[in-house]
Interface confidence: low
């Protein structure tokens, strides 16, 4: 099937040396209301900022050619923790998540996630407790109520516990993550597992008969062969960001989801540089509407697992791993000993049939071209809430294939990619160094003018 993503975030909490301040208690019922549109919008922006922070750091420290993570999954795990966090620890969690919503962040996130992409989206969370460890009743109740995290006792037998956890993860991710944990530390007191399984279908499917072997340009010199999905008149929302220059396109899924791909037009880019000026607003301009576009998009299978302790520490959460105030969970001192995250992504042609009438109407409009044939970043957004569900980068979609040296005339300009810039301007320096959106202007590329 076409598009499947299974991220899983796990927080391991262990015993901490005693010490700390008096607990603060927030008034009951203060967070029980449904989020307002403004709160939802603010949260989407906050999540996008968190996504940029998190993914920039992950990409900086990773040597993998392809990355994928679910910021929503990580945020949910941290929000779950925030239910029992107090004082400075709670404050730090809110700062890192860019959420100035006080104690209501877990409630907001969990409430919004309940309505995410019906049918395509499955959220599962579970808590594993050390046998006999005293956890506060209030935390257990709220965990189950907000995150569906029914507490399960660890047996204390490592092999059994490991088998049980991995079996649950496998089921929760519908087989996409077979073996999440390879071991359990002796001092594990509390495991917070958060699994998200996503299966989307393109709103307009790709015709498998048009998929063919094509070149993906790794850099100015090398290509790798990929299976490239193609469409002649795909209804696509796209635009160009400048400084750095990036093509952006929104590929709609059924169930109010979007696959948003960002293709920098130059090879010399890094994730941090691209994300530095990227906000939710920048990726969601109003009034950029679908237009018929000749599209090429590689088939993908991505899988990535990482431990986020170092990354979250760099973001300002080192306290979690040293001496957090988690007395909302237990009066006994706790420390987070590990944060594991895994996602898998599969992109293929399957989708919903496009209505013939749409195709005919659109074929009368001017046609442009959008080719994803070089390194790119992507997001998966839930469109109703605006929440970023996944983020990833693809440097080499086929790392097992041998690299091929480009023919001389291909380098360095990559005529084929330049053709895909048809209608996109360059060199308009009206607006200084910030990231900006530019509407396509054919006079800048007369040789690539759209057919009328």
């Amino acid at each position: 099937n076409q598009e499947q993503v299974s991220p899983l975030t796990l927080l391991k909490l262990g015993n901490q040396e005693p010490g700390g301040q008096t607990a603060l208690k927030s008034p009951p019922g203060v967070c029980s209301r449904d989020p307002t549109p403004e709160q939802t919008h603010r949260l989407a922006r906050a999540m996008m900022a968190f996504t940029a922070d998190l993914f920039s750091l992950v990409a900086q420290t990773s040597t993998c050619p392809n990355l994928i993570l679910s910021p929503l999954s990580v945020a949910l795990a941290l929000s779950h923790l925030a239910l029992g966090a107090q004082n400075h620890t709670l404050q730090r969690l809110q700062q890192v998540l860019h959420a100035g919503s006080g104690p209501c962040l877990p409630h907001l996130l969990s409430r919004l996630c309940q309505d995410l992409g019906p049918g395509a989206f499955r959220l599962a969370a579970r808590m594993y407790l050390q046998k006999g460890f005293p956890i506060k009743e209030d935390f257990l109740e709220q965990s189950e109520q907000l995150f569906g995290a029914k507490p399960v006792s660890l047996t204390g037998k490592q092999e059994d516990d490991l088998a049980n956890i991995n079996q649950w993860v496998k089921e929760a991710t519908e087989g996409k993550i077979q073996e999440f944990l390879s071991g359990l530390p002796e001092d594990t007191v509390l495991l917070l597992l958060n699994a998200i399984h996503f299966q989307g279908f393109w709103r307009n499917k790709f015709d498998p008969s048009l998929t063919q072997r094509d070149s993906f340009h790794l850099d100015e010199q090398f290509t790798v062969p990929v299976e490239m999905m193609q469409a002649r008149t795909y209804p696509l929302r796209w635009f160009l960001l400048e400084q750095p220059e990036i093509q952006v396109a929104h590929f709609p899924f059924k169930n109010n989801m979007s696959f948003v791909v960002l293709v920098p037009t130059h090879f010399e880019w890094n994730v941090s540089q691209v994300l530095a000026n990227l906000s939710w607003d920048t990726l969601h301009p109003p009034l950029v509407w679908e237009r018929p576009t000749k599209v090429r998009l590689p088939k993908l299978y991505l899988k990535h697992q990482m431990d986020l302790v170092a990354t979250l520490s760099q973001l300002g959460l080192q306290e979690l791993f040293q001496a957090p105030d988690l007395r909302g969970i237990s009066e006994q001192s706790l420390v987070v000993s590990g944060v594991q995250h895994q996602s898998t992504l599969e992109l293929s042609e399957v989708g919903v049939e496009a209505a013939a009438a749409t195709s005919i109407a659109m074929s009368r409009m001017s046609l442009s071209s959008f080719s994803v044939n070089r390194p790119f970043l992507f997001f998966i957004f839930e469109d109703t809430t605006g929440l970023p569900l996944f983020v990833g980068s693809v440097r080499n979609p086929n790392p097992s294939a041998p690299r091929e040296l480009k023919e001389q005339q291909d380098s360095p300009g990559n005529k084929d990619f330049l053709q895909s810039l048809k209608g996109f301007p360059r060199g308009d320096k009206l607006f200084g160094p910030d990231l900006k959106l530019v509407p396509p202007m054919e006079e800048d590329y007369p040789q690539f003018g759209s057919p009328k």
């Epitope: 403004e38 919008h41 607003d281 920048t282 409009m365 910030d434 959106l437 054919e442």
Partner: antibody, heavy 121, light 111 residues
Amino acid sequence: EVQLLESGGGLVQPGGSLRLSCAASGFTFDDYAMSWVRQAPGKGLEWVSAIGTGGGTYYADSVKGRFTISRDNSKNTLYLQMNSLRAEDTAVYYCAREYYDSSGYYHLDYWGQGTLVTVSS
Amino acid sequence: QSVLTQPPSASGTPGQRVTISCTGSSSNIGATYDVHWYQQLPGTAPKLLIYSNNQRPSGVPDRFSGSKSGTSASLAISGLRSEDEADYYCAAWDDSLSGWVFGGGTKLTVL
């Protein structure tokens, strides 16, 4: 040089119809969203409607169901079909080009000189 | 009733500095949408004066500046001149209305 030239205004009775046109030149019309903004005599500016690059439309609540915005890219022309006109629709109607800015949101960078629509019996 | 609130009038003598405020809500200015300012000289179409809170299009003198904070924005005109006498409008995109919203306009008089 970017130019927008509105036409089609005039005197019309309440309940009547009118079609405004805005001829665009000096830029690639297909690649810009466009808006209609009106200004009643002695009053402030009021946004009426907008159309995106692919033909998607937005309307102010006050005109929803009565006005229709459209564009003909081959003629570089923006239209506003106004039906069931009311006295309160009396205004100078401007067409304006939507331009992206550095934050990812639009501003209306070029405006036409406007065409006067008077709804009166 | 305009969605964005501006004072109906403002005045100053030549050479003075005048500030015009614009207050919105969480669905427009407060939703991090940019604020734009337009100048309308008597009998003419509006002209873009400031875009994206504080950016000046080419040809607009640096006497004009803009700023934004929270759900409010302001336009400042320093070294006031007689040719600055005009109506000034703020505008922003509004999420809940899915459209542009304008302030009611401020009539600036140079005394």
